[in-house]
Structure formats: structure tokens, C-alpha cells
């Protein structure tokens, strides 16, 4: 017969760690108990438990709690044993001894490793503005035993770049993701994806751009000139623009005060009934907290307009 | 700094045993695991085991069971590497390894001859 | 027991040049368990990337690894005099620990 073993076994900082031992031995033979000790520098081996055939699992005052049995059902030449919740110091070599009936005595070693998972965090950077050269957007950190792995995923054109420092048996990892700002960015996802293998999957943290920009003003309602002549109704300029933060807008008059009954809501100049008095150059103002624009028009209101809407009506009428 | 320094070259009968040092200096010796890695002329790394220098631990690759015995001395921060019946194709340069996960300070490495 | 292929096995190329370097594991592997080593004519080898992509100290950052699986790269921005040498790959999430045959870049 042999020992089904493994030379290397890993688990994760407070799971249970399954040492394995199996006896494969011909039909006839039988596992009469299974020794588990620890290779310690100072004793030479430390006593964890002790597995009869007939009287059951034995655990060492020292490990008290922390050794069990895997959960049935249990093949009686399956010595393996649980180490619960497993922490940096049970990292060394465990040697299981095995007392058969009638092939006498087999022991094998192994080694523990415990793997410490990162705990990820992202930190953004400064305020994103359009015109900026290239930028730091965030940064993402992790630390773990083994190292982890830290990337990024995004749409988003950027560079990345990464720094890592070792301390014993354990690594922190800092990766950078910086870019050149635009608008078109406002929005996008920015996410840090971290691997290890103490994670059952990638760690994501996800960030969303801001990108502050201010484009440029322009008014929207004077494409026709004719429609603003003595007497139209419901007259209105608009103020085009786009920001992040989302911009406010004013309204002033270049040769004085906005005329009696004409009134500002957010982008838009509404007009009374027009008059000739209406006429004038009038200035939109947009700005948030990057910028401010500005864009003038000069409104001139026709006194005798030719007015097609009542051609039509007498027309029709005639 | 962390320093791995091992014994010289060494010219060997075949059948005949030899043992390579590797004395650490720079971090606490029994903190980390030492393996053993060899390179035969023109060829690649081959591993062939490790020792804890804390508990005195070992495994061996199973090409080199039966052949090696890796040792250590805590008090001199020293760990060793024996290969028993040696045969012409064991000359090889022979390196030690600091593990920590990877292998992070190697030794410079001892060149052992085995020729009749 | 894993096995690691590195490919081209020689890499000829000039200083400046950019180099590509493959390493395809049999397995696959954690990338926390990847490492890259240089070894230059009788030296013993250097640590240069360990966990797939992360720079071991004193590394200059022309060098930086990626990948992921079983599929694994080592690049070299743009070579240097001092950057001709055999690279290896290793895998130390397994035992046995096991190492790639090497890739020889070499001056063209």
C-alpha cells in the first residue's frame, strides 16, 4: 500500500485547511490509527491529533477546537484531518504517520501555506478639467500574500502603471491610471480589477468619471429673421451650452436693463409681445465652477413686417 | 543586504557524494524557505527541493529522492545540499534560492564537476 | 506537474527594439504565481517580475509582465545593450515548482 498525500497545501487566512492522508492498500488491510504532528524547530514534532481506528479522534490540548475530522462519510483509510481557521502562524510542514494492519507504518509530510486576500481600495485623484495634459484619474491599491495582480478595465484611452513593494511574504500593490481629460469621458466607468488566488473571484471597484469642461455658448432663435417683427407672440432665445458641473445661465442687455415684461428661466429669454423697444444686442453668460462663456445677438424687431400668416388666411378665405 | 554566499567548485568521481553551502546573511535565516535550483551546461533551471530552516522541513523533487539530502545549521544561518551517487550528468552548476513565494536573492552559484 | 513553454526559444533582435517574450503554462495558473527571471553567461538569475506583472526592485520599468490563465507575456519596452540574455519563466503555485526552458534574446 501507499499514502495518497499532497506535498503542498494551501488555504486561505481563516478557512479550514484539509490536510490529506489517504491509505490505498490492498482489500484486507486496515488503517488501525493515524498520527498528525507538527515539525516544530524546538520539540522536532508537536503532537496535533490522533485518529483510532476504534476509539476515535484525539485532539492535543494545543489544538483544542481547531482539529476535526472532514464530515462523513468517512472512508475508515482516510486519515485526513481539518485545521479550522487557519491563520499565518499555522504556515510549516504537518506529518501524518499511518499504522496499517498487516503492512505496518507509512508517514508523509506536507507543507501549509496560508494565503492572505487583498483587501482593495480605489482613491480617485485630483478634479478631472478638460485641457488638462495627462492626469492621474485614480489609483487602486491592494496588498495580499501572494501578491495580487491589479489592473484596469475601461472603455476609457488611458496608461497604466504600476509600483509594488514586498514586506516578508506578502506584497502591496499600487497601480495608477492616468489620462488626458475630454468631455466624452464624463460618465465612464473606471474599474480596478484585482486577482488573487485566496479570491474565489476578481475584486472590482468601479469609479465614475468627472470630467469638468465648459463648451462654448451659443443662441438658438434667430434663424429667421422675418418672425421677429411688431406684434409676435411668444418670442423666445435660447442659450446653448454643456457643462460638468451642469452650468447657470444669465441674461443681460448690452445698452441697458432687459425691457419690461421680458423674462429669464435658466437658458431661455422669453418675450412679451414684441415692440421696436425689444431691439438691442442681448448677452448670454454661462459658467459653472471651471469657466465662464458668453455669447451676444442683436435682435432687430421689424416694424411692418409682410405677414404670411394672414396672406394665407385670405386666400383661403377668398 | 540579503547576501547568499555558497562554497566553491567542486570535481567529483562518479558514485561519489558532494556537499554545497549556502551561508545567508542580511534577514533572519529561519524566516524564510531555501531551495535548491541546478543547471546543467547550456541548459535550463531544474528544481530540486527546498528546507525550512526554521523547523528543518524538507521536500525534494521526486527525480532527486533517494539521492538528496538538504540540511541546515541555524546557529552558523547556513543550509546545505547533498547529492549522493553521483553521475556524469549531475555536473551542473548548483544555486540556492531564498523563497518568498518567488525566489528573490539567489546564491552565485557552485559549479560541481563530476568526471572520472 | 505543470509545465511552462516559452517561445521564440531565440529572439534576435537590435538595441531599441521591442521585445515579446511568451510563456504558456500546460495548467492554469494563479497570476499571483508567476514570476520572470534574467540570466546573463555565468551569473546566477535575477528576479526581474514576480506575480505576473509586478516589477521586482531595482527593476527598470521597460520590463513589465501581464497575462493571465495559462498565457503569460514578458515585455522589454526597448532593449538595451544590458537586456541580452536568457529569460526565464516560473510557476511557484505548484509543487513541483517548475521553470520554462528559457527564451535567448540575442543581439541581431
Known amino acids: 500500500g501507499e499514502l495518497e498525500t499532497s506535498d503542498l497545501v494551501t488555504v486561505v487566512l481563516g478557512q479550514d485547511a484539509k490536510l490529506p492522508c489517504f491509505y490505498r492498500g490492498d482489500p484486507d488491510e486496515q488503517v488501525g490509527q493515524v498520527a498528525w504532528a507538527r515539525v516544530d524547530p524546538n520539540e522536532g514534532t508537536r503532537e496535533l491529533a490522533l485518529l483510532h481506528s476504534k476509539y476515535g479522534l484525539h485532539v492535543s490540548p494545543a489544538y483544542e477546537d481547531r482539529v476535526e475530522q472532514p464530515p462523513p462519510p468517512r472512508d475508515p483509510l482516510d486519515g485526513s484531518i481539518l485545521l479550522r481557521n487557519a491563520v499565518q502562524a499555522d504556515e510549516g510542514e504537518y506529518e501524518c504517520r499511518v499504522s496499517t494492519f498487516p503492512a505496518g507504518s507509512f508517514q508523509a509530510r506536507m507543507r501549509l501555506r496560508v494565503l492572505v486576500p487583498p483587501l482593495p481600495s480605489l482613491n480617485p485623484g485630483p478634479p478631472l478639467e478638460e485641457g488638462q495634459g495627462l492626469t492621474l484619474a485614480a489609483s487602486c491599491t491592494a496588498e495580499g500574500s501572494p501578491a495580487p495582480s491589479v489592473t484596469w478595465d475601461t472603455e476609457v484611452k488611458g496608461t497604466q502603471s504600476s509600483r509594488s513593494f514586498k514586506h516578508s511574504r506578502s506584497a502591496a500593490v499600487t497601480s495608477e491610471f492616468h489620462l488626458v481629460p475630454s468631455r466624452s469621458m464624463n460618465g465612464q466607468p473606471l474599474t480596478c480589477v484585482v486577482s488573487h488566488p485566496g479570491l474565489l473571484q476578481d475584486q472590482r471597484i468601479t469609479h465614475t468619471l468627472q470630467v469638468a469642461f465648459l463648451a462654448e455658448a451659443s443662441v438658438r432663435g434667430l434663424e429667421d429673421q422675418n418672425l421677429w417683427h411688431v406684434g409676435r407672440e411668444g418670442a423666445t432665445l435660447k442659450c446653448l451650452s454643456e457643462g460638468q458641473p451642469p452650468p447657470k445661465y444669465n441674461w443681460t442687455r448690452l445698452d441697458g436693463p432687459l425691457p419690461s415684461g421680458v423674462r429669464v428661466k435658466g437658458d431661455t429669454l422669453g418675450f412679451p409681445p414684441l415692440t421696436t423697444e425689444h431691439s438691442g444686442v442681448y448677452v448670454c453668460h454661462v459658467s459653472n465652477e471651471l469657466s465662464s462663456r458668453a455669447s451676444q445677438v442683436t435682435v432687430e424687431v421689424l416694424a411692418d413686417p409682410e405677414d404670411p400668416g394672414k396672406q394665407v388666411d385670405l386666400v383661403s378665405a377668398s | 543586504q540579503v547576501q547568499l554566499v555558497q562554497s566553491g567548485a567542486e570535481v567529483k568521481k562518479p558514485g561519489a557524494s558532494v556537499k554545497v553551502s549556502c551561508k545567508a546573511s542580511g534577514y533572519t535565516f529561519t524566516g524564510y524557505y531555501i531551495h535548491w535550483v541546478r543547471q546543467a551546461p547550456g541548459q535550463g533551471l531544474e528544481w530540486m527541493g527546498w528546507?525550512?530552516?526554521?523547523?528543518?522541513?524538507?521536500n525534494y523533487a521526486q527525480k532527486f529522492q533517494g539521492r538528496v539530502t538538504m540540511t541546515r545549521d541555524t546557529s552558523i544561518s547556513t543550509a546545505y545540499m547533498e547529492l549522493s551517487r553521483l553521475r556524469s550528468d549531475d555536473t551542473a552548476v548548483y544555486y540556492c534560492?531564498?523563497?518568498?513565494?518567488?525566489?528573490?536573492?539567489w546564491g552565485q552559484g557552485t559549479l560541481v564537476t563530476v568526471s572520472s | 506537474e505543470i509545465v511552462l513553454t516559452q517561445s521564440p526559444g531565440t529572439l534576435s533582435l537590435s538595441p531599441g527594439e521591442r521585445a515579446t517574450l511568451s510563456c504558456r503554462t500546460s495548467q492554469s495558473v494563479s497570476s499571483s504565481y508567476l514570476a520572470w527571471y534574467q540570466q546573463k553567461p555565468g551569473q546566477a538569475p535575477r528576479l526581474l517580475i514576480y506575480g505576473a506583472s509586478n516589477r521586482a526592485t531595482g527593476i527598470p520599468d521597460r520590463f513589465s509582465g501581464s497575462g493571465s490563465g495559462t498565457d503569460f507575456t514578458l515585455t522589454i519596452s526597448r532593449l538595451e545593450p544590458e537586456d541580452f540574455a536568457v529569460y526565464y519563466c516560473q510557476q511557484y503555485g505548484s509543487s513541483p515548482i517548475t521553470f520554462g526552458q528559457g527564451t535567448k534574446v540575442e543581439i541581431k
Open positions: 528546507i525550512n530552516p526554521n523547523s528543518g522541513g524538507t
Open positions: 534560492a531564498r523563497e518568498d513565494w518567488d525566489f528573490d536573492y
